[in-house]
Structures are given as C-alpha cells and as structure tokens.
C-alpha cells in the first residue's frame, strides 16, 4: 500500500489556445486530469488501473501552481494504491479548459482539451522527487513525482505491513524494510522479553523490565549468583541453595559448633601450648613456672618447699636459695653436721644414729615431718591429687581442684564423656581412655552419629509442584524450596490462593 504523488509546478500556455488551435474565451481556465496505470510500452487509452485524480481550476493560460491545497485541490496530487508497487508505471496528464463550473468529463465539449502528455518508465519507492518537463508546440508543463509507502507500510515495494508498538504485546519500531527493531532493553521475536542487568545469572535470575535482576528462590546478590545458605547457618557457606558447608574448625548442622577452640579463643596464657580436645574442649601445656587450667597462675619455686631441715627458702630471679639452720648445709640443707648428742629432733621426735654416729635420722610423731620433725605435716606434700589436680590446704584438711574431665576426692575418677549424651539420633556412647566413641544406629554415621546416611525425610517426595526438597537433619524433617508462583510448607498453594482449611 502506498501513494503515487504528483506535484504540478508550472503550466505555460502563452497564447491561451486549445489543442485545436482555437483560442479560449476570455482565457483558458485550466484544470488537470491525471491517469496512472500499469506500464505500457506505448501508452494507450483505457482503464486507469492504478487510479485517477482531477484538480480544480488552478489558473488561466500560464501560471505557477502553489505547493498546497488551495481551491479545495491538493498539490502534490495523491494517487493511493492498495497493492505491491510494481516498480514501473504509465502516466497521462491532461490539461483542460473549463468554460463553466462543471468539470465532469461528460459536461465538457471534446475540444476543451488544451494538451495531453503521456510518459512511462521505472520508478522505485523513495522520498526523492523526479523532476520532469514536457513541451508541445503550444504548451509546456513542469512537474515532479515520486512513490512513497502509506503509513505502516515498508519495503522496496510497500508490501511489508508493520505497526510499531510499545506495550506488553511488544516493544518495537519498524525498520525501513518492515522488519521489527526492538526498543532498547528488549529482545525476542516480538521484543516482549526484557534484557536483564548485564551479568544477571541466566538460570537463577530474571527481570520484569530492562536492566533489572530479580532472584529466583534460593539465590541472592546483585547478579543472583550467590546461593542463600540454610537458615541459621553460622560459620558455613553454600554452593547450592539451603546448604551449610562448614568453614574449617566448625561443625554441626548449622556450623555453630566450635571444633578449633584454641585458634578461635586463644585460652592458654603465658606462652602455654594449646591442644584442641573436642567440641569447646582444650588442654593447656604450661611452660615451667606456670600452672592452672589456662596456665594463668605463676608458680613460686619456693611453693614446693625445697629446703630441708628447717632451711628457709628465698625466691630469686633464676630460681631459689635455701638459708640453712645451724648444723646443716647443702643446696637444700640436706647435709647435717649434727649427731643425736645434739638432740636435733623436735616435737618429740626420736633420734637414731646412722653411719657409726656420723649422721642421724629423726622418727617423727604423727602430724610432724621434716628431717628434724620441725614441720607440721602439709597434707599436699605427698601430691595426693591425681590426673594433674591441684592440691589446696584447708587447715587440718586438704582439697583437690580437678582438671576438666576428672572428679573424686583425689581427682582419681574420669568424668564419663558419655554423661552429656553426645551421640545423636540414639547412638550408643562408649567411654575411652582419652575420649569417647559413638556406635550409630542404622541410617546414621559420623563421630556423633550426626550424619544421616540412608533415612531421608525427602525420600517420600513430600514437596509439590516441582519444588526442591532439603532434609533438615536437626529435626528429621524436610524443607521445600518452592518454584516461582507457589507457597506453602509443601509448595502446594499457587501464589494468591489461600489454603482451604476443612473447618
């Protein structure tokens, strides 16, 4: 569909005569009839197959034609066609004299014709005008013409219909050849799909308008390329949604169980060496001169009462020094210069000669000790506390402060590691010398029977509408990850549809 346009520019009839040579009275009131038809090698009369058009009277004798619609006519003249433009044509332009106001062919005498021109040729669709001038013996006509496509028609022969649109059924304009050209940000056969933010993950992201990136369930981040870990995951990551893969040193379903207390908390003081010994459990190996669970206590070297025979101990930077009483000598005052004759035994101790009187030994009564029975018994001297327990004097009695994992008056009892019921899912606990062991029931494994191996809450396919099922090991239940458009614990409800309850 298109329009053949003819622009009349100037008509010259200086003598004001008709084709017959007869003059017009008073002058030639001139109007035009145009006939457009298919190509003919020799243009002949007959039907104007492509259309006809007439003008009103445009002037008298010689005149220029204004480029407008004056007098009710139109310039350029429009000859619309509703077919594919063939690229060739024939054109007949007749100039007529109108003696009266009636311009109908039947109302005019045959000799009212002023001039007739006929041309034919090729003409491509386009915006450019072709200028032409036709001269006869008495007249001259200057005009130009072109073929353009009607609104919504495109292509070399105006055969391609295209109506631009910008709504949910398409976002496009029409190219000169009639093909669609998507508006910026749109793609697809009819430009109905928005182009998402550059880099938006193809599967995990989508968009409802251009340059957007909306994440599908289980994904997050600007480009929807980061999975969402299991709800409550503390020290873990995921590679697919709802996972919780623990960082080094962490364990448990939510990666919230500290398996590397030493590194995370540095509990050992004063340069002690820390060893992990289970969940939230550790042992400090103290450097010389320190004691306590965390090696937080500084040991005085005199605390172990190294001086014998009533010698007094003095702490020094690099150790200690014993001040011996008269009659004794040696690093710990262990050597005596006395004999039983000197009554060296105190507190009722009895003296016994040794080495032919060169030496002696005191036999002390109860509650006294020392080479000369000079010390009241320190109940901690015998180091009665087992398993590294710390002995504390409490007047006439003593008390052991036990290290973690031991109990009893003398820390002689190993606390059962099984007392805390550490084995999950009904596992049986066995105490070992340095730890415990779990014997797991069928379907579970791992140090604490925490790993489910065969019994799976997802095995029964409880999720509807192609939802993805994840097993929650902490509760023996499942979690359904719903696809777009569904909600509910089993993804059984389409979005917008409330569940129907039986009551």
């Amino acid at each position: 569909s298109g329009v053949f346009q003819l622009q009349l520019q100037e008509f010259i009839n200086e003598r004001g005569v008709l084709a017959s040579g007869r003059p017009c009275e008073p002058g030639c009131r001139t109007f035009f009839r145009v006939c457009l038809k298919h190509f003919q090698a020799v243009v002949s009369p007959g039907p104007c197959t492509f259309g006809t058009v007439s003008t009103p009277v445009l002037g008298t004798n010689s005149f220029a034609v204004r480029d407008d619609s004056s007098g009710g006519g139109r310039n350029p003249l429009q000859l619309p066609f509703n077919f594919t433009w063939p690229g060739t044509f024939s054109l007949i332009i007749e100039a007529w004299h109108a003696p009266g106001d009636d311009l109908r062919p039947e109302a005019l005498p045959p000799d009212a014709l002023i001039s007739k021109i006929a041309i034919q040729g090729s003409l491509a669709v386009g915006q450019n005008w072709l200028l032409d001038e036709q001269t006869s013996t008495l007249t001259r006509l200057r005009y130009s013409y072109r073929v353009i496509c009607s609104d919504n028609y495109y292509g070399d022969n105006c055969s391609r219909l295209c109506k631009k649109r910008n709504d949910h059924f398409g976002h496009y304009v029409c190219q000169p050849d009639g093909n669609l050209s998507c508006l910026p940000g749109w793609t697809g056969e009819y430009c109905q799909q928005p182009i998402c933010l550059s880099g938006c993950h193809e599967q995990n992201g989508y968009c409802s308008k251009p340059a957007e990136c909306l994440c599908r369930p289980g994904w997050q981040g600007r480009l929807c390329n980061e999975c969402i870990p299991h709800n409550g995951c503390r020290h873990g990551t995921c590679s697919t949604p709802w996972q919780c893969t623990c960082d080094e040193g962490w364990g448990g379903l939510f990666c919230d169980q500290d398996l590397n207390y030493c590194t995370h908390h540095s509990p050992c003081k004063n340069g002690a060496t820390c060893s992990n010994s289970g969940q939230r459990s550790y042992t400090c190996t103290c450097r010389p001169g320190y004691t306590g669970v965390d090696c937080e206590l500084e040991l005085s070297e005199c605390d172990s009462n190294p001086c014998r025979n009533g010698g007094s101990c003095k702490d020094q930077e690099d150790g200690y020094h014993c001040l011996c009483p008269p009659g004794y000598y040696g690093l710990h005052c262990e050597h005596s210069t006395l004999s039983c004759a000197d009554s060296p035994c105190f507190n009722g101790g009895s003296c016994r000669e040794r080495n032919q009187g060169a030496n002696y030994a005191c036999e002390c009564p109860p509650n006294f000790t020392g080479s000369n029975c000079e010390k009241k018994v320190d109940r901690c001297t015998s180091n009665p506390c087992a398993n590294g327990g710390q002995c504390l004097n409490r007047g006439p009695s003593r008390m052991c402060r036990c290290r973690p994992g031991f109990t009893g008056t003398y820390c002689e009892l190993h606390v059962s590691d099984c007392a805390r019921n550490p084995c999950a899912h009904g596992g049986t606990c066995h105490d070992l010398e340095n730890g415990l062991m779990c014997t797991c029931p069928a379907g579970f494994s791992g140090r604490r029977c925490e790993v489910r191996t065969s019994i799976d809450a997802c095995a029964s396919s409880p999720c509807f509408n192609r939802a993805t099922c994840y097993t929650d090991l902490s509760t023996d239940t499942f979690v359904c990850n719903c696809p777009y458009g569904f909600v509910g614990s089993r993804c059984e409800f389409p979005v917008g549809l409330p569940p129907s309850f039986p009551w």
């Epitope: 649109r165 949910h168 398409g170 697809g188 009819y190 109905q192 968009c207 409802s208």
Partner: antibody
Framework: QVLLIQSGAEVKKPGASVQVSCKAS????????VIWVRQAPGQGLEYMGW????????NYAQKLQDRVTMTSDTSTTTAYMELRSLRSDDTAVYYC??????????WGQGTLVTVSS | SYELTQPPSVSVSPGQTARITCSGD??????AYWYQQKSGQAPVLVIY???KRPSGIPERFSGSSSGTMATLTISGAQVEDEADYYC???????????FGGGTKLTVL
C-alpha cells in the same frame, strides 16, 4: 505438538473463588505468554488478561482487575487463573491460549465454571 | 473503555464473497486479529496483524485494514465457514485489549 490442557469443570457458590489451570506442552513455555478469555453462555468472547510465562508480568482487563490473579509455574509449565468473589454472571467457559506478539495461536479446550447458589 | 464494533450477522450464498468489518478508533495504529469460532469449539486464529494468514488457514480467508476499519474477507464462502467471527485489538495505549462483539456468518 503444542497442547494446552485445562482443568475440569467447577461448580461454585456466589462469593467463592475458583482456580483454573492450563498445562502447556510441546513448546518452550517461557518464550510465550498466556492469555485468558471467557465466554458466557450465548455471548461473545471477553478478554480477561495476559501473563508472561518468562517473568510473571501481567495485564488484566480493567473490569476484572480487582478480582483476578494470573500466575505461572515454569517448573510444571502450567498457568493458573484465579477469580475471586464469584457472581452468577461469572458463569462461563474459561479458555487459556498461547500468546506471541498478540496472536493467540493455540487454545485450551475450555473449562466450564458454573456459579450458582 | 475501548470498543471494537462488528455487525451482528452477515449472510452469503455458497461461493459468494463474505466481508465482515470491525471498526475501532485505534485501528490505524494497532493491528487487528480475526478468530473463527464454530459452535461448541474453542476459537481459531484465521488472520493476524491485519493481513497475515497462519499456516493451515485456507487462502480464501484474507484481511485488510484502512483507517479505522479492518475487514475479514472470505472469497468464495463455503458451508463449513459458517461460524462466529471475532476481531481483536488494543487501544492506542496498548493497555486495554478487547474482542469485538462478534459476527455470525451464515452461508445458505
């Protein structure tokens, strides 16, 4: 071949809701839209709305905007139309159809919804 | 609200040309689509984008559009063409889509 299979007939009371499903097969679901059209007994076709199967964008007929919801599930290639607050004049055959560039080239078989007290 | 107007009925004898019109203010800028619906059946697309014919639709069906009027032409109508015909289009904004009221074609 392209098929759109709709859910079965429904009888509902005034004020209730109805959901009609439209299971698509034989083509790439997310490359097309789905439109819903209804036809009351002895009456003409009435456009209800459109949904993009790719991203869930919707366009609803003004008259039904407050009562209709259209959704789609790419995992099951199924479109849904829910109509709430049903009235007797909602009694009709409800059709879904595949849409591309505003052409509705394949249609479901239709679902009769009867609203009666 | 936007409307598309169709004649309620058109009658032709077999072999004659049937013309069904559809008028709407936005049709100069918006495409018209034509659907055929036979009794008790789902509609079938017979013309899309004013003038295009889907594969499988007989050549006797053609479409045209001029100004605010779209026309479905059935050249040499046959008895099996007896059906209701609906035009479909959108308003100028593209937000409101409507079917025409439908035209019952009788071929007798």
């Amino acid at each position: 071949q392209v098929l759109l299979i709709q859910s079965g007939a429904e009888v509902k009371k005034p004020g209730a809701s109805v959901q009609v499903s439209c299971k698509a097969s034989g083509y790439t679901f997310t490359n097309y839209g789905v439109i819903w059209v209804r036809q009351a007994p002895g009456q003409g076709l009435e456009y209800m709305g459109w949904i993009s199967a790719y991203n869930g964008n919707t366009n609803y007929a003004q008259k039904l905007q407050d009562r209709v919801t259209m959704t789609s599930d790419t995992s099951t290639t199924t479109a849904y139309m829910e109509l709430r607050s049903l009235r007797s004049d909602d009694t009709a055959v409800y059709y879904c159809a595949r849409e591309l560039g505003s052409s509705f080239d394949y249609w479901g078989q239709g679902t009769l919804v009867t609203v009666s007290s | 609200s936007y409307e598309l107007t169709q004649p309620p009925s058109v009658s032709v004898s077999p072999g004659q040309t049937a013309r069904i019109t559809c008028s709407g203010d936005a049709l100069p800028k918006k495409y018209a689509y034509w659907y055929q619906q036979k009794s008790g059946q789902a509609p079938v697309l017979v013309i899309y984008e004013d003038i295009k014919r889907p594969s499988g639709i007989p050549e006797r069906f053609s479409g045209s559009s001029s100004g605010t009027m779209a026309t479905l032409t059935i050249s040499g109508a046959q008895v099996e063409d007896e059906a209701d015909y609906y035009c479909f289009s959108t308003d100028n904004s593209g937000d409101h889509s409507v079917f025409g009221g439908g035209t019952k074609l009788t071929v007798l």
